[in-house]
Amino acid sequence: KFSKQSWGLENEALIVRCPRQGKSSYIVDWYYSQTNKSIPTQERNRVFASGQLLKFLPAEVADSGIYTCIVRSPTFNRTGYANVTIYKKQPDCNVPDYLMYSTVSGSEKNSKIYCPTIDLYNWTAPLEWFKNCQALQGSRYKAHKSFLVIDNVMTDDAGDYTCKFIHNENGANYSVTATRSFTVKDEQGFSRFPVIRAPAHNETKEVEIGENTNLTCSACFGKGAQFLATVQWQLNGNKITDFSEPRIQQEEGQNQSFSNGLACVNTVLRIADVKEEDLLLRYDCLALNLHGLRRHTIRLSRKNPIDHQSTYC
């Protein structure tokens, strides 16, 4: 259940995170699952445990197997399993499927390729990038932090992209490579200044005290895949996360929809058990992309009690 596949190449660094790790600072013990033998924490060992991380510096084919991690607390131990496979380096350029990370797709307007697993390593820029084993050269390719951006993506940019970087551990350097496929969606898209579909600017919504209500912030940003397009709610000019009122929550994740070919994004603000003080707040729907920011404000008002009374005597 709490198991994660990890893989690497012999003579490269491999760092694996415990699948059960939630918060930092908890004690994590690592074991070889087959023998129940504890993995040492001393860094002089080629394979050693470092808190939530298990480090193979460098990895060997014989390291393949299942490793157990236990996140320890006096009242709640939590166990996870790392299924590690180390492969021999391929003599030719071909990268087999079992060494591939998840495929990403892009378009003319969105061509980010993230280097998989890089956040686990102590690396310094720049990353080296290869396509089908050829080093990428030219002004179209920009290695930015942990990802590659390709300008003016074309269909023949599809292929297998490998990132290569150096992991540094106590002054010693180890090479790491990771490969993923990139596919190109052929679509003529465009981006424009955000248009907010809902709410209308300076709208007022009637609500009942004690009831739940939802506010939808919906905006369109152009056609096709968008490089940056986000919508969010603010309360009195503050982020929802900075507003310590658990009754008011912005739904996690944003729903993307394509309306008449337009790329539209919406997010819902859920207000549970509406209170009098909620009527005093200013609710701002913000839509942001590379062209700029648009804001629509909505306020809540108390539903007129007469609405609930029968017109018949």
Partner: antibody, heavy 117, light 111 residues
Framework: DVQLQQSGPGLVKPSQSLSLTCTVT?????????WDWIRQFPGNKLEWMGY???????YYNPSLKSRISITRDTSKNQFFLQLNSVTTEDTATYYC??????????WGQGTSVTVSS | DIVLTQSPASLTVSLGQRATISCRAS??????????MHWYQQKPGQPPKLLIY???NLESGVPARFSGSGSGTDFTLNIHPVEEEDAATYYC?????????FGAGTKLELK
């Protein structure tokens, strides 16, 4: 994000059972974590009552062990508190919460329960 | 059961000043290099909110003006500089053994 919504009666008669429901959205209660009940007495004192882990194991506060039962309905992603033989001393605000390791990371909105005839 | 004693029961601090809250456990809550003491903030009409876990680790999203320290039986929550929104009741909680218990709370008011 994990969200917890509580429901249940606000008034219970002495010697009867108190039953509360906590409905979880945004996370499956069988995936991980422990799912707690905590109460806060009128003087603001907090008491951990017990929890049910993702595996179904339960842990109770010994001070309540003979009267408390925490169960779940995995199909509805709900967990429940039942406290038997209540007295006026059980008047409190009852919270459900999520324990990831040792701390209650997400809380329900709280349900005020009065025990009175 | 491990009893947690908080002091003071209430304190009044000026904006921008330091607030210090103590929590003493009836027996050690530290073991194997970690201290299983945590701090929460509660505002009226709201559930408690986790601030600090394992004595000194700041929970994600909590402002850096909150800090925790201590080991064994003596723990401290510091808030500096105190801001208006910090007016609340603060609780310590241990997880060294069952049952988990809380302190009685410290009410922080602003001058």
């Amino acid at each position: 994000d994990v969200q917890l919504q509580q429901s249940g009666p606000g008034l219970v008669k002495p010697s009867q059972s108190l039953s509360l429901t906590c409905t979880v959205t945004g996370y499956s209660i069988t995936s991980d974590y422990a799912w707690d009940w905590i109460r806060q007495f009128p003087g603001n004192k907090l008491e951990w009552m017990g929890y049910i882990r993702y595996s179904g194991d339960t842990y109770y506060n010994p001070s309540l062990k003979s009267r408390i039962s925490i169960t779940r309905d995995t199909s509805k992603n709900q967990f429940f508190l039942q406290l038997n033989s209540v007295t006026t001393e059980d008047t409190a605000t009852y919270y459900c919460a999520t324990t990831m390791m040792d701390t209650m990371d997400y809380w329900g909105q709280g349900t005020s329960v009065t025990v009175s005839s | 059961d491990i009893v947690l004693t908080q002091s003071p029961a209430s304190l009044t601090v000026s904006l921008g000043q330091r607030a210090t809250i103590s929590c003493r456990a009836s027996k050690s809550v530290s073991t194997s290099g970690n201290s299983y003491m945590h701090w929460y903030q509660q505002k009226p009409g709201q559930p408690p909110k986790l601030l600090i876990y394992l004595a000194s680790n700041l929970e994600s999203g909590v402002p850096a003006r909150f800090s925790g320290s201590g080991s064994g039986t003596d723990f401290t929550l510091n808030i500096h500089p105190v801001e208006e929104e910090d007016a609340a009741t603060y609780y310590c909680q241990h997880s060294r053994e069952f049952p988990l218990t809380f302190g009685a709370g410290t009410k922080l008011e602003l001058k």
